[in-house]
Interface confidence: medium
């Protein structure tokens, strides 16, 4: 399934954002984890820029396995919410938030779920959505992100993520894979790729490729457990590299490199 919606107005919209069940008014969304950079930031309002700002180059640069390679893939994993589920609910979490791997190397986007009742196997669905905004462009040119951020922050929504939260009609949406029991089915676009759902609900790519950059949503559906936080997402960025220089987007904190 591929949906290529193309709007002509503002690049951000009223996306779904975080999924908190309405019956849990006491359960606040977990704030996004932003990572700081030095005084050059100059902009207190750049909540999203902080996602791009800091030290991936410092974390990655000294790793010998990274030198001289053509590209790297950076996976930024983000829990959409974090709260205790009530009875008869699903709790989906994305853990191990940092993966830096070489292009064409494997990567696993970890996802686990807990259910309060398990009479039937739930369906695990991994869905891909392209970024709402160009992370690289915003990292290189912070002015291009300011206007939209200012509007959102002025509306009292400092947790707004302009790269993830927008209407599906203005981005590409695809089902990557689904799993029920031991049966894994790849979406049409991913047929022929060595991609599978392993373990509890982890999405594993044998080889990452150009075009894999985007937001990956892990959702778990069960007829018995209708409440709860049944979705979490991971951001995956495929980046080109200068040979011998491990400078990527200015600002992600690097996790371990998988080679």
């Amino acid at each position: 399934m591929q949906q290529d919606g193309l709007g002509v107005g503002t690049r951000n919209g009223s996306g779904k954002g975080r999924s908190v069940h309405p019956s849990w008014p006491w359960c606040a969304p977990r704030p996004l984890r932003y990572f700081g950079r030095d005084a050059r930031a100059r902009r207190a309002q750049t909540a999203a820029m902080a996602l791009l700002a800091g030290g991936l180059s410092r974390g990655l640069g000294s790793h010998p396995a990274a030198a001289g390679r053509d590209a790297v893939v950076f996976v930024w994993l983000l829990l959409s919410t974090w709260c205790t589920a009530p009875a008869r609910a699903i709790q989906v979490t994305v853990s191990n938030p940092y993966h830096v791997v070489i292009l064409f190397q494997p990567v696993t986007l970890p996802c686990t779920y807990q259910m309060t009742s398990t009479p039937t196997q739930p369906i695990v669905i991994w869905k891909y959505k392209s970024f709402c905004r160009d992370r690289i462009a915003d990292a290189f040119s912070p002015a291009s992100v300011d206007n939209q951020l200012n509007a959102q922050l002025a509306a009292g929504n400092p947790g707004y993520n302009p790269y993830v939260e927008c209407q599906d009609s203005v981005r590409t949406v695809r089902v990557v894979a689904t799993k029920q029991g031991n049966a894994v089915t790849l979406g049409d676009y991913y047929q022929g790729r060595r991609i599978t759902i392993t373990g509890n609900a982890d999405l594993t790519f044998d080889q990452t490729a150009w075009g894999d950059s985007g937001v990956y949503y892990c959702s778990v559906v069960s007829a018995q457990d209708l409440q709860g936080n049944n979705e979490a997402y991971a951001e995956l960025i495929v980046l080109g590299r200068t040979s011998g220089v491990a400078e990527l987007l200015p600002g992600f904190q690097a996790g371990p490199i998988e080679d």
Partner: antibody, heavy 115, light 109 residues
Framework: EVQLVESGGGVVQPGRSLRLSCAAS????????MHWVRQAPGKGLEWVAV????????YYADSVKGRFTISRDNSKNTLYLQMNSLRAEDTAVYYC????????WGQGTLVTVSS | QTVVTQEPSLTVSPGGTVTLTCASS?????????PTWIQQKPGQAPRALIH???YKHSWTPARFSGSLVGDKAALTLSGVQPEDEAEYYC?????????FGGGTKVTVL
């Protein structure tokens, strides 16, 4: 009004060096990434290099990697391209372009590498 | 080596419609490649028309529109004017690298 003015082009022998400049005005230069793009005579556009708003991150096309260096001086609102070990195939008009979507372009400066 | 492919040339009548396409050797072009379309007239510097697949600059005439068609990025000129005769370049972003297509020469006859 946004203006980008390239300079520094000329005729140079193979193996020699040249430094191009791009003077920017009409926008907050220090807030935007900048590109260099070139066009050989009668040919298409070729991306050369990009630099982030603060100069901390740079990317290069494979064809110039290790020979060309992109830099900027935000206090002077100027973008630079240092070109070393020039080859005949580097002969082209060199353009600077603003932001990563290349919304504004300069008029270009011609670099001719010839013995 | 990544290659971006465009039609070498297309001919259109004044008032007609023409669609230029842009393909990537790496597979389907999606919005994640942030397709950009640039126009260049003979003897002039390039000028950006469309960015991020379909977004127009303030100076872009309404008759130009960008989209994704199948596995390609597309630029459609509707109600073509004589002044639209030019070379049109597609630009795709591959992480930290930008690749231009070879350009499409649009002739208005």
């Amino acid at each position: 009004e946004v203006q980008l003015v390239e300079s520094g082009g000329g005729v140079v022998q193979p193996g020699r060096s040249l430094r191009l400049s791009c003077a920017a005005s009409g926008f907050t230069f220090s807030s935007y990434g900048m590109h260099w793009v070139r066009q050989a005579p009668g040919k298409g556009l070729e991306w050369v290099a990009v630099i982030s708003y603060d100069g901390s991150n740079k990317y290069y096309a494979d064809s110039v990697k290790g020979r060309f260096t992109i830099s900027r001086d935000n206090s002077k609102n100027t973008l630079y391209l240092q070109m070393n070990s020039l080859r005949a195939e580097d002969t082209a008009v060199y353009y600077c372009a603003k932001d990563l979507n290349m919304d504004y372009w300069g008029q270009g400066t011609l670099v001719t590498v010839s013995s | 080596q990544t290659v971006v492919t465009q039609e070498p040339s297309l001919t259109v009548s004044p008032g007609g419609t023409v669609t230029l396409t842009c393909a990537s050797s790496t597979g389907a072009v999606t919005s994640g490649y942030y397709p950009t379309w640039i126009q260049q007239k003979p003897g002039q510097a390039p000028r950006a028309l469309i960015h991020t697949t379909s977004y127009k600059h303030s100076w872009t005439p309404a008759r130009f529109s960008g989209s994704l068609v199948g596995d390609k990025a597309a630029l459609t000129l509707s109600g073509v004017q004589p002044e639209d005769e030019a070379e049109y370049y597609c630009l795709l972003q591959y992480g930290g690298a930008w690749v231009f297509g070879g350009g499409t020469k649009v002739t208005v006859l």
